[in-house]
């Protein structure tokens, strides 16, 4: 390990997973590093091996239990350390006292489906995955629709400022192929960030009826 610019970022999925990314400029790709989790009020300690995801970054998941089990609460503190092997010893490269509910990133929404489609409209629903019951309704969503000839980055963002697991897309073009994605974010947590985007849902609007103004 070298003293290049380094960054250690972890997020809690609100149930039983802490995902961490460690990046360090100039570090050797075969450097052996791990994340160690030491909670303040739990009997378990957890370790995961950091595996390369790019030239200078590594990632791992601390799996704390069954996917839908509530393993941490708002009062928990988990001390997270990055340990890298230097010869015969382990060196602490980064350390933080991690407050799970200040550092949330939920799983991407799942089970996207077209509820109803017309010539100019489409109603789509989805579900959230592995989200804590603590949030009750304190979630928000962002959605985007990919139109022909455009990129995802160009797609305008639609914001849903409440826990609403459906959307009615309007002013669509008849007989046109679209794709749709959605992501979710809890309102809680200073360092909380958006979930990954869902898998895209492809759909096609109905053709306009011949001889009719639709």
């Amino acid at each position: 390990a070298v003293n290049g610019t380094s960054q250690f970022t972890c997020f809690y999925n609100s149930r039983a997973n802490i995902s961490c990314v460690w990046s360090q400029d100039g570090a050797l790709q075969d450097t052996s590093c791990q994340v160690h989790a030491w909670p303040d009020r739990r009997r378990w300690n957890q370790t995961c091996e950091l595996l390369p995801v790019s030239q200078a970054s590594w990632a791992c998941n601390l799996i704390l239990g069954a996917p839908d089990s509530q393993k941490l609460t708002t009062v928990d503190i988990v001390t997270l350390r990055v340990l890298c092997r230097e010869g015969v010893r382990w060196r602490v490269m980064a350390i933080q006292d991690f407050k799970p509910f200040e550092n949330l990133r939920l799983m991407a929404p799942i089970s996207l489906q077209v509820v109803h489609v017309e010539t100019h409209r489409c109603n789509i629903s989805w579900e959230i995955s592995q989200a804590s019951h603590y949030f009750e309704r304190h979630l928000e969503f962002e959605a985007r629709t990919l139109s022909p000839g455009h990129t995802w980055e160009e797609a305008p963002l639609l914001t849903l400022k409440q826990k609403q697991e459906w959307i009615c897309l309007e002013t669509l073009t008849p007989d046109t192929q679209y794709e749709f994605q959605v992501r979710v974010k809890p309102l809680q947590g200073e360092f909380t960030t958006w979930s990954p985007w869902s898998q895209p849902l492809a759909f096609r609007t109905k053709p306009a009826a011949l001889g009719k103004d639709t």
């Epitope: 380094s6 303040d40 001390t79 602490v92 980064a94 933080q96 006292d97 550092n103 360092f191």
Partner: nanobody, 126 residues
């Protein structure tokens, strides 16, 4: 806005003790790692000690290890530095500093600080 105000400095004889305090405001104190740094006359900034957001991890420069103790009281939004067995070479302006996140990096402890206070003068002399 973020404010860090140090106090507790003064003149002390070699071998004596002082406790520095740093009152923090304008941010959620427990969400951030903190540190003490110092600047001796005519010298650059020197890292002294760091502490994680809830005090479960602490780190010290070799020059102060065993003599200084960093701690924090998150209920009072206050960072402390207990300095014992003071030496003339500890004479400096002491600053409390916030890291930009809950993480600090022991191999490069000067990295990632985003706010610093105005400092408090510590003079060790007989």
């Amino acid at each position: 806005q973020v404010q860090l105000v140090e106090s507790g400095g003064g003149l002390v004889q070699p071998g004596g003790s002082l406790e520095l305090s740093c009152a923090a405001s304008g941010f959620t104190f427990s969400n951030y790692a903190m540190s003490w740094v110092r600047q001796a006359p005519g010298k650059g900034l020197e890292w002294v000690s760091s502490i994680t957001g809830f005090g479960r991890g602490t780190d010290y420069a070799d020059s102060v290890k065993g003599r200084f103790t960093i701690s924090r009281d998150n209920d009072k939004n206050t960072l402390y530095l207990q300095m014992n067995s003071l030496k003339p070479e500890d004479t400096a302006v002491y600053y409390c500093a916030r890291y930009s996140s809950s993480t600090y990096y022991p191999p490069t402890p000067a990295r990632g600080r985003d706010y610093r206070g105005q400092g408090t003068q510590v003079t060790v002399s007989s």
